[in-house]
């Protein structure tokens, strides 16, 4: 029925599904499900019945509005949530909210893959290591973000000397959080510490 | 079975403030929402908004946007309408009055409290 | 918002008669109408819901119809205990709005 929402959360947080308008006037009866078939949750006009699910004892139904409210979610609450409303002439009517949930970033380390000077130039190859996620990189010296194309996990630059920077860091970021690492280096071109 | 009952009649000067009550009994307060609705001396009803008692957010009419303030104390089912600065024209009978379970119908209503506003 | 316009806006009328109050809408708001009496010095009591849904404890004597604009309450046999005065109200949209009310007098 087309009432579809994408939401994005971090893990551990309380969450509220709801739609963003009025309930139908007069229906029957509203339930949320997941993954289409599973019932989280029912209301008749006069009690909320929740049923056995993962979800028993994390969430609270607001009858006058709709709204579910799920408390510290996780991954694995990922899923597709339905709020179908049916309606005394017999038809319903559906919203769907489809809920990502995603933990939040760890800080990067910068490895310092190599560092060569090269006729007063330097050559600087960072990687930022964190352990396997789907994050963006953003890399900055002296916090002045470098140029999008070489923006990804490894920087691979040759920098001249009025480009020099003393600190360089990795920003890696989902929707939900960023983390920073920096490492620092002598100049022109030589380690200092992490 | 449901239940509302509204505190007693207030007397006031115009510029004082006034907080009715309306404590709710023989089903689960946070359930259904609660309207207002004030009824001028021999005139007709006139809604003047609700409160969505699971989340505690007020919505006004048009008319009682500014001195009108709806709250909830949850613990003792009790809803209230505060009224600032009041004026002679707000002299009428309050009511609070149950949202039904499905729709905007008010299936319930308090007694009613009547505010006089007189100098 | 939408207005609800009653009428008569008062009847005078005979135990055992047939009453009929009408309420129209300044816009089509599908069936949802409902209705109160109120006695006086009392607080208003929902007599009927959704246009024509009946109420538990309320007498089969009252009953609605109507769709869109324009609705009707109708007492079949009235009795003495029916004098009061009658109010719509709508649900459709925001705000809410109640009719300037009927009032029913006994002969």
């Known amino acids: 029925q087309g009432h579809l929402v994408h939401m994005t959360v971090v893990s551990g947080s309380n969450v509220t599904l709801n739609i963003s308008e009025s309930l139908p006037e007069n229906y029957k009866q509203l339930t949320w499900f997941y993954t289409f078939d599973q019932k989280i949750v029912e209301w008749d006009s006069r009690k909320s019945k929740y049923f056995e699910s993962k979800f028993k004892g994390r969430v609270r139904l607001d009858p006058q509005s709709g709204a579910l409210y799920i408390s510290k979610v996780q991954k694995e609450d990922n899923s597709t949530y339905i709020m179908r409303v049916l309606k005394k002439t017999g038809n319903e009517q559906e919203w769907k909210i489809k809920l990502q949930v995603l933990d939040p970033v760890p800080k990067p380390v910068i490895k310092i893959e190599k560092i060569e000077d090269m006729d007063d130039n330097c050559y600087l190859k960072l990687s930022c290591v964190i352990p396997g996620e789907s994050v963006n990189y953003t890399w900055y010296g002296d916090k002045r973000p470098f140029p999008k194309e070489l923006q990804n996990s490894v920087l691979e630059t040759t920098l001249m000397p009025h480009n020099y920077s003393r600190c360089y860091t990795c920003q890696v970021s989902n929707s939900v959080s960023s983390k920073n690492g920096t490492v620092c280096l002598s100049p022109p071109c030589t380690l200092a510490r992490s | 079975q449901v239940q509302l009952v509204q505190s007693g009649s207030e007397l006031k000067k115009p510029g004082a403030s006034v907080k009715v009550s309306c404590k709710a009994s023989?089903?689960?307060?946070?359930?259904?929402?609660m309207n207002w609705v004030r009824q001028a001396p021999g005139q007709g009803l006139e809604w003047m908004g609700w409160?969505?008692?699971?989340?505690?957010?007020?919505s006004y009419g048009n008319v009682f946007k500014g001195r009108f303030v709806f709250s909830l104390d949850t613990s003792v089912s009790t809803a209230y309408l505060q009224i600032s600065s009041l004026k002679a024209e707000d002299t009428a009978v309050y009511y609070c009055?149950?949202?039904?379970?499905?729709?905007?119908?008010?299936?319930?209503w308090g007694q009613g409290t009547l505010v006089t506003v007189s100098s | 918002e939408i207005v609800l316009t009653q009428s008569p806006d008062f009847q005078s009328v005979t135990p055992k008669e047939k009453v009929t109050i009408t309420c129209r809408a300044s816009q089509s708001i599908g069936s949802n109408i409902h209705w109160y009496q109120q006695k006086p010095d009392q607080s208003p009591k929902l007599l009927i819901k959704?246009?024509?849904e009946s109420i538990s404890g309320v007498p089969s004597r009252f009953s609605g119809s109507g769709s869109g604009t324009d609705f009707t309450l109708t007492i079949n046999s009235l009795e003495a205990e029916d004098a009061a005065t009658y109010y719509c109200q709508q649900s459709n949209s925001w705000p809410l709005t109640f009719g300037g009310g009927t009032k029913v007098e006994i002969k």
């Open positions: 959704y246009t024509s």
């Open positions: 009055a149950r949202r039904h379970g499905n729709g905007n119908v008010f299936d319930s």
């Open positions: 409160i969505n008692t699971f989340t505690g957010e007020p």
């Open positions: 023989g089903y689960t307060f946070t359930d259904f929402g």
